[in-house]
């Protein structure tokens, strides 16, 4: 009988040790979670405060309605211009309306004057159709005024208040476009 009691006592003690271990593990886990929670909260706080302080467009970009525009200060060929825009999370300018065209040409007049600026328009070599970079067709009023007499690929650019076309391998300034951040605060 005494042996039985002693065995039960040992089993209870073993159970107690296991529970203490589990409690210790749980405490450690809780502490780890609390630390992670703190880190997450700090991260979110930072993100929120930077979002709160940030304007809809990055520095040196111009805003018009839901878009931000960047007018380059360097020349490059059309394909490199596209890559430069992608590095900034944007694409070459896609002009959707006459209003947008007027805004762009008006802004360019103020900034730089009458230079050439690549936009995201190119001519399909097979069909001769003009297409924006996302595959959509320009509205009839926004087709390049002159057809380039080039055997090479032909791309669109803005000069003064006109859309024109040129060999994609010529060097020009370029304009990038991205969506403006919506302020939800």
């Amino acid at each position: 009988k005494l042996l039985q009691v002693s065995t039960i006592a040992m089993q209870q003690q073993e159970k107690l040790i296991q529970q203490e271990r589990a409690l210790l593990n749980f405490t450690e886990w809780k502490r780890s979670c609390a630390l992670q929670m703190k880190y997450c909260q700090a991260f979110m706080q930072n993100s929120l405060s930077s979002a709160h302080n940030s304007s809809p467009c990055p520095n040196n970009w111009i805003q018009n309605r839901e878009s931000c525009y960047y007018v380059s200060e360097i020349w490059s060929i059309w394909h490199t211009s596209q890559e430069n825009c992608l590095k900034e999370g944007s694409t070459l300018l896609q002009i959707e309306s006459k209003e947008e065209m007027d805004f762009i040409t008006g802004s360019l007049r103020k900034i730089k004057g009458s230079y050439d600026y690549w936009v995201g328009l190119s001519q399909d070599g097979h069909s001769g159709r003009w297409l924006w970079q996302d595959g959509s067709s320009p509205s009839p009023g926004l087709l390049p005024a002159e057809r380039s007499q080039s055997a090479n690929q032909v791309c669109g650019y803005v000069k003064s208040n006109s859309l024109l076309s040129s060999n994609c391998s010529t060097w020009k300034y370029f304009i990038c476009e991205k969506y403006a951040l919506r302020s939800s605060v």
Epitope: L86, G89, S90, E177, Y179
Partner: nanobody
């Protein structure tokens, strides 16, 4: 550093379809856009399609209307759906991540269009 892993390449008949995937890992918060390039033997590497974090897309003239680039909601995987494939689409397809300071490339996946 950003690591990129492509998959989905293979042999397909003209007119067929393939879907390429590119999974990004590492410092994915630095990525502003992701794109697909291709390089055929003896030719220069060319941009096929790209997508920005904001969802803007850009395509090479030769693939417009046939290829579609997209990304998952988390933004760390980009897909290239290639339809109506032609023999001239045969190339090694590379994934690229665009950041302000650096560009990161995947190892590439072979796409062969042949009957």
């Amino acid at each position: 550093q950003v690591q990129l892993q492509e998959s989905g390449g293979g042999l397909v008949q003209p007119g067929g379809s393939l879907r390429l995937s590119c999974a990004a890992s590492g410092r994915i918060f630095d990525i502003n856009a992701m794109g697909w390039y291709r390089q055929a033997p003896g030719k220069q590497r060319e941009l096929v399609a790209a997508i920005t974090n904001g969802g803007q897309t850009t395509y090479a003239d030769s693939v417009k209307g046939r290829f579609t680039i997209s990304r998952d909601n988390a933004g760390n995987t980009v897909y290239l759906q290639m339809n109506s494939l032609r023999p001239e689409d045969t190339a090694v397809y590379y994934c690229k991540a665009f950041t302000r300071s650096d560009d990161y490339w995947g190892q590439g996946t072979q796409v062969t269009v042949s009957s």
